[in-house]
């Protein structure tokens, strides 16, 4: 119905009021719900109303505003401190202790975060984004510096429909269209072989507790698993001779670690060169990511931080020990 210049939507009635004609919904069930567009942000709950905008948001603190879009900082909250002496004693021993796995305790001194003590160091959001990994979109954390809110703003729940098949046929130089989607890792770029690469700046340097021969044997699964977490594609970097940059890793060289090892090995000298795992250099190829998403890593810094964030959550499927983002061409060093 309409009255004058006011056009009312389906199911609404026009009423003349002292301030002019207004649309009104006599029965919210018969009208288009204002909640249909999910207007309430940051976990606010939406309630249908009879008058425009036909919804009201009940906001969860610390948010306010008609759509819960405003962040209100709590009155000068003192920064959290890591109070436990226990955590101070156990930090940086290479073991993740959940009681110390907090931002205040630097994620157990890096033990829970692949040695990265603050993956959110570049995140300038007013929110503590590490506390907002909660399976719902928090736009204030949805930036590359804040690790894209753990990809919770773009249907993180999508899973690869034919996961077993796609895993078996990942990066096998044959395009499987059923696997050529973001959630299936774009078939390891098998369907984009004719497209130019789109490399992110830098290199991911990862230490993983698998010997080089085992890692290379399992490379497709390894790259798919990490690519799934980063929502892009990875490849092992090649050196100037064209060789894959996967090197034996002999473990920590710190004095503390060496001291511990001396106490636990019968013949330390003889076993000094025992291979503990691999150091692998990875590149990010965004050629498919940029076509399907605006959440791609332009450099490897935030990608490394996101892997550290997954370590904190305990969602890594490989025994990663450390991750570093290198900007320059790396030397082949231990």
């Amino acid at each position: 119905s309409s009255c004058g210049q006011v056009k009312c939507r389906k199911g609404e009635q026009c009423v003349h009021t002292a301030s002019g004609p207004r649309c009104f919904c006599p029965s919210p069930r018969d009208c288009e719900s204002g909640c249909a567009s999910s207007p309430c942000q940051h976990g606010g709950s939406c309630h249908p109303q009879r008058q425009p905008p036909y919804y009201s948001c009940q906001c969860a603190p610390p948010f306010s505003g008609s759509r819960c879009e405003l962040y209100t900082a709590p009155p000068s909250t003192p920064p959290a401190t890591c109070l436990s002496q226990y955590c101070a004693d156990k930090a940086r021993d290479g073991v993740c202790d959940e009681a110390c796995n907090s931002h205040a305790c630097q994620w157990d001194g890096g033990d829970c975060s692949l040695t990265m003590e603050n993956p959110w160091a570049n995140c300038s959001s007013p929110l503590p984004c590490w506390d907002y990994i909660n399976n719902q979109c928090d736009e204030l954390c949805n930036t590359v510096e804040c690790l894209f809110d753990n990809f919770e703003c773009q249907g993180n729940s999508k899973t690869c429909k034919y996961d077993k098949y796609c895993a078996d046929h990942f990066k096998d130089n044959h395009c499987d269209q059923g696997c050529n989607s973001e959630e299936c890792g774009w078939d390891g770029l098998d369907c984009a072989a004719d497209q130019p690469e789109n490399l992110a700046e830098g290199t991911l340097v990862i230490v993983v507790l698998m010997p080089p021969e085992q890692l290379l044997q399992d490379a497709r699964s390894f790259l798919r698993a990490l690519g799934t977490l980063l929502h892009t594609n990875l490849r092992i970097k090649r050196d100037s001779q064209g060789e894959l940059m996967v090197y034996p890793y002999y473990g920590e060289k710190s004095a503390a670690m060496k001291k511990q090892r001396m106490t636990r090995r019968s013949l330390p000298g003889e076993q000094e060169q025992e291979v503990a795992g691999s150091k692998v250099f990875l590149e990010i190829d965004n050629r498919q990511c940029v076509q399907d998403s605006d959440h791609c890593f332009k450099n490897t810094d935030a990608a490394a931080a996101l892997l550290a964030s997954h370590a904190i959550q305990g969602t890594l499927s490989y025994p990663l020990v450390s991750v570093v983002s290198e900007s320059l061409t790396p030397e082949r060093t231990q």
Epitope: D93, D97, N101, D111, L209, A276, G314, L320
Partner: antibody, heavy 122, light 107 residues
Framework: EVQLVESGGGLVQPGGSLRLSCAAS????????MSWVRQAPGKGLEWVSY????????YYADSVKGRFTISADTSKNTAYLQMNSLRAEDTAVYYC???????????????WGQGTLVTVSA | DIQMTQSPSSLSASVGDRVTITCRAS??????LAWYQQKPGKAPKLLIY???SRASGVPSRFSGSGSGTDFTLTISSLQPEDFATYYC?????????FGQGTKVEIK
């Protein structure tokens, strides 16, 4: 198949020493933490000690701190529990158990050995 | 140290019964709780981890629930092979601690 096999248990006098071994097979020994858990006759389970073979980091229950030492030989895929100054209350079946989360002591123990009996008696 | 208190310490039940065992932590442990089953002369076996996730090969009649300080293990329909002792264990922080056990016996 992932397997843990303990050995080294036996009868020992109070104040004596004993070394238990836990041979691991079927998985990457370096990658997973290992605990020793004991059970006194007719009693419940008591955690004793933990080691992460990769870093050598160790954790102990207060009841054994200073008397027991956990270690690991990554070349032999074996964890050890060196028990000194043994007391009657240390009498128990000792189990080694693998932690399910790579470098996390904060993970459940998903694989257990069959246990080895330690009896401390005069 | 975090204390774990299990109840009851023992219970008698019949095949087909629904059995519930509770476990309480002296402080919040989030979901860092496991349940183990132990039969006489055998090693413990992991049933539930993360308070509610079933370990590989564990029948669906076993379920876990709870978070924070209060947890429950439920056996929906008791089978003959389920008569055993059940332990809860927190792995939130060291020292790792177990409940005192609940013995499930045949009525």
């Amino acid at each position: 198949e992932v397997q843990l096999v303990e050995s080294g248990g036996g009868l020992v006098q109070p104040g004596g020493s004993l070394r238990l071994s836990c041979a691991a097979s079927g998985y990457s020994f370096t990658s997973y933490g290992m605990s020793w858990v004991r059970q006194a006759p007719g009693k419940g389970l008591e955690w004793v000690s933990y080691i992460y073979p990769y870093s050598g980091a160790t954790y102990y229950a207060d009841s054994v701190k200073g008397r027991f030492t956990i270690s690991a030989d990554t070349s032999k895929n074996t964890a050890y529990l060196q028990m000194n100054s043994l007391r009657a209350e240390d009498t128990a079946v000792y189990y080694c158990a693998r932690h399910s989360g790579y470098y996390r002591i904060s993970s459940a123990m998903d694989v257990w050995g069959q246990g080895t009996l330690v009896t401390v008696s005069a | 140290d975090i204390q774990m208190t299990q109840s009851p310490s023992s219970l008698s039940a019949s095949v087909g019964d629904r059995v519930t065992i509770t476990c309480r932590a002296s402080q919040s442990i989030s979901s860092y709780l496991a349940w183990y089953q132990q039969k006489p002369g055998k090693a413990p076996k992991l049933l539930i981890y993360g308070a509610s996730s079933r370990a590989s090969g564990v029948p669906s009649r076993f379920s876990g629930s709870g978070s924070g300080t209060d947890f429950t293990l439920t056996i929906s329909s008791l089978q003959p092979e389920d008569f055993a002792t059940y332990y809860c264990q927190q792995y939130y922080s060291s020292p790792l601690t177990f409940g005192q056990g609940t013995k499930v016996e045949i009525k």
